[in-house]
């Protein structure tokens, strides 16, 4: 048994997943409506949000989330104690710092309490799902007449666990120059033109020593250095999102 649906979207598999049943050997369980996927992110190792698309449910359903770690003294699932809501329907769970174990396999179960057989269990490596806060306290200093050093700080996460993406450009540049800085929250620009005005910004990710997160933080607040007397072209200087 299987269901078919005609779709003309490049993402037809993903969209269809919400309305198709499984194709399985005959002796397997009867078809049930698939549950939405759960997506979890650990925010700066301060808390974790696990969310799902509650609007994909054909009727408003308060799905429940239970979780556990693969290796733990108490191997039973515990229910979310802090649900997130969207239009008064559960759409996520916030898990606090003391319940986060980055280096244990995280097992999360989404269930329809009205149809207990409707359940989906996912496994996640949380160390690959960390999103740091945006770097803060960006400061610029002159190392020499034409050499600049940029420093910044990251809260709550060891510096060696982070990789940084630095972007800078002058008021004369159409695009950003960018480079990766590993583990050390500083970067030096060997040659700057004092007649130009420079803008710097930084973001970070939890990679590659302590985890393999592909998700970058938000950009830091930009900092500026250089001549205020140069007439700037606003269209070139506007910060990109």
């Amino acid at each position: 048994w299987s269901s078919k649906v005609l779709m003309s979207s490049a993402n037809e598999d993903i969209k269809a997943d919400l309305i198709l049943t499984s194709t399985a050997p005959e002796h397997l369980s009867a078809p049930t409506l698939p549950l939405p996927e759960v997506q979890c992110f650990v925010f700066n190792i301060e808390y974790m949000n696990c969310t799902w698309n509650s609007s994909s449910e054909p009727q408003a359903t308060n799905l429940t989330l239970h979780y556990r770690y693969k290796v733990s003294d108490n191997n039973t699932f515990q229910e979310c104690s802090h649900y997130l809501f969207s239009k008064e329907i559960t759409s996520g769970c916030q898990i606090q710092k003391e319940d986060i174990q980055l280096y244990q396999t995280f097992v999360v179960q989404l269930q329809d309490p009205q149809k207990p057989q409707r359940r989906a269990v996912q496994k996640l490596n949380l160390q690959n799902l960390v999103i740091p806060r945006a770097p803060e306290n960006l400061t610029l200093s002159n190392l020499s007449e034409s050499q600049l050093e940029l420093r910044w700080k990251s809260r709550h996460i060891k510096e060696r666990c982070l990789q940084y993406l630095v972007q800078y450009r002058s008021n004369r540049d159409r695009s950003w120059t960018e480079l990766i800085v590993n583990h050390e929250p500083r970067f030096s620009l060997p040659s700057v033109d004092e007649l130009k005005r420079y803008t710097f910004r930084v973001r970070s990710r939890y990679n590659p020593i302590c985890g393999s997160s592909q998700q970058w933080s938000k950009w830091s607040q930009p900092v500026h250095w250089g001549s205020h007397t140069v007439e700037e072209n606003p269209s070139l200087f506007a910060l990109e999102a």
């Epitope: 993903i14 499984s22 592909q214």
Partner: nanobody, 126 residues
Framework: EVQLVESGGGLVQAGGSLRLSCAAS????????MGWFRQAPGKEREYVAI???????FYADSVEGRFTFSRDNAKNEVYLQMNSLQPEDTAVYYC????????????????????WGQGTQVTVSS
């Protein structure tokens, strides 16, 4: 529609090895969560190895260190290398796939998979 076809099963002595293959047609597996499941006579179906398209792989405790999941997106195939096989590994092995939006999704619940192969028998004699 995705069709999954398993191969590589057979009869092997305890301590031996087998490599199961699962070939997909109809759609690329590059954004699919994939899993290998098994069902022994009179027992419930259980997951053996599951994989997210972002590369996170998880194994059942009973096979950890002996079985290895891999995928070849260019060939549109996934594999299960089974070493140090034991009689209790005897079962029909199924390959399953689920399209996913997120690179980190790996399902251990069988009802989360939309597409299934017909299975390949693995028998381990003592």
């Amino acid at each position: 529609e995705v069709q999954l076809v398993e191969s590589g099963g057979g009869l092997v002595q305890a301590g031996g090895s087998l490599r199961l293959s699962c070939a997909a047609s109809g759609r690329t597996l590059s954004r699919y969560a994939m899993g290998w499941f098994r069902q022994a006579p009179g027992k419930e179906r259980e997951y053996v190895a599951i994989d997210s398209w972002g590369g996170d792989t998880f194994y059942a405790d009973s096979v950890e260190g002996r079985f290895t999941f891999s995928r070849d997106n260019a060939k549109n195939e996934v594999y299960l290398q089974m070493n140090s096989l034991q009689p209790e590994d005897t079962a029909v092995y199924y390959c399953a796939g689920a399209p996913t939006s997120f690179a980190t999704t790996a399902y251990s619940s069988s009802n989360s998979y939309r597409y299934w192969g017909q299975g390949t028998q693995v028998t381990v004699s003592s």
